[in-house]
Amino acid sequence: VLEVYYTSLRCRCVQESSVFIPRRFIDRIQILPRGNGCPRKEIIVWKKNKSIVCVDPQAEWIQRMMEVLRKRSSSTLPVPVFKRKIP
């Protein structure tokens, strides 16, 4: 599940990983667009083991995965998978 959140918080990610995470270990992926106190886009992966990983948005694996999910959602769903939450 991909989620896009718009928040007024500062950057949440201190350290980012580029290591591939298999989808069976992922609960959801949260995307925080740049702006609102943080100058960069942030991607947070919530894992099924209850741990959280910040992923480098430039990491090849996450870009590839998001492209696959976008293609899949646009071809099978009438609405995009991106959920917008504005507090």
């Epitope: 290591v19 591939f20 995965m65």
Partner: antibody
Framework: EVQLVESGGGLVQPGGSLRLSCAAS????????MSWVRQAPGKGLEWVAE????????NYAPSLKDRFTISRDNAKNSLYLQMNSLRAEDTAVYYC?????????????WGQGTTVTVSS | DIQMTQSPSSLSASVGDRVTITCKAS??????VYWYQQKPGKAPKLLIY???YRYTGVPSRFSGSGSGTDFTFTISSLQPEDIATYYC?????????FGGGTKLEIK
Amino acid sequence: EVQLVESGGGLVQPGGSLRLSCAASGIDFSRYWMSWVRQAPGKGLEWVAEINPESSTINYAPSLKDRFTISRDNAKNSLYLQMNSLRAEDTAVYYCARQEDYEYYALDYWGQGTTVTVSS
Amino acid sequence: DIQMTQSPSSLSASVGDRVTITCKASQDVNTGVYWYQQKPGKAPKLLIYSASYRYTGVPSRFSGSGSGTDFTFTISSLQPEDIATYYCQQGYSTPLTFGGGTKLEIK
């Protein structure tokens, strides 16, 4: 030091059953996915099955799932593989391995293996 | 199932040589590829994770690259202790699958 020690292998007749065990020490066993991987004599590695910490998610190699059952007992730091209706082609060294899911997402620790021989 | 086709199946090289092993996945596995070293009578050891990251304690002469379906494992300068069989594995989806292995020998 992380240690995974397999046991329970041996000689069994075709059609028989065997239960393999893997005793873990040096890791917080209850936090990790675990896998069984086997290797027939002179052959390559073949993944058998995996189980998540809560035993709520289990995945098998499709060709084995009707005969093999993976399970675990977190209180005993132990992983098991129940093998039924054994065939000659199940003859192999069976390894247990930790499926790390925090940093590497790989099979990062392996036991020394236990040998299963299916023969009449 | 995702098939991992590894080549060559065996390889003879001299100490100091650059050695390259390739692995081809039957479908896109992103960067979910891992490389293992196995010495005779021993359990496999993890060398490379996420296609290109060296595992803790692995010498810098070992490296990996690739994404999608094509992956490469390289030993930049072969050492006598590198004699072993090397396996690729995809962890993109279950069932997890391994390449057939590459047996490396010293010339």
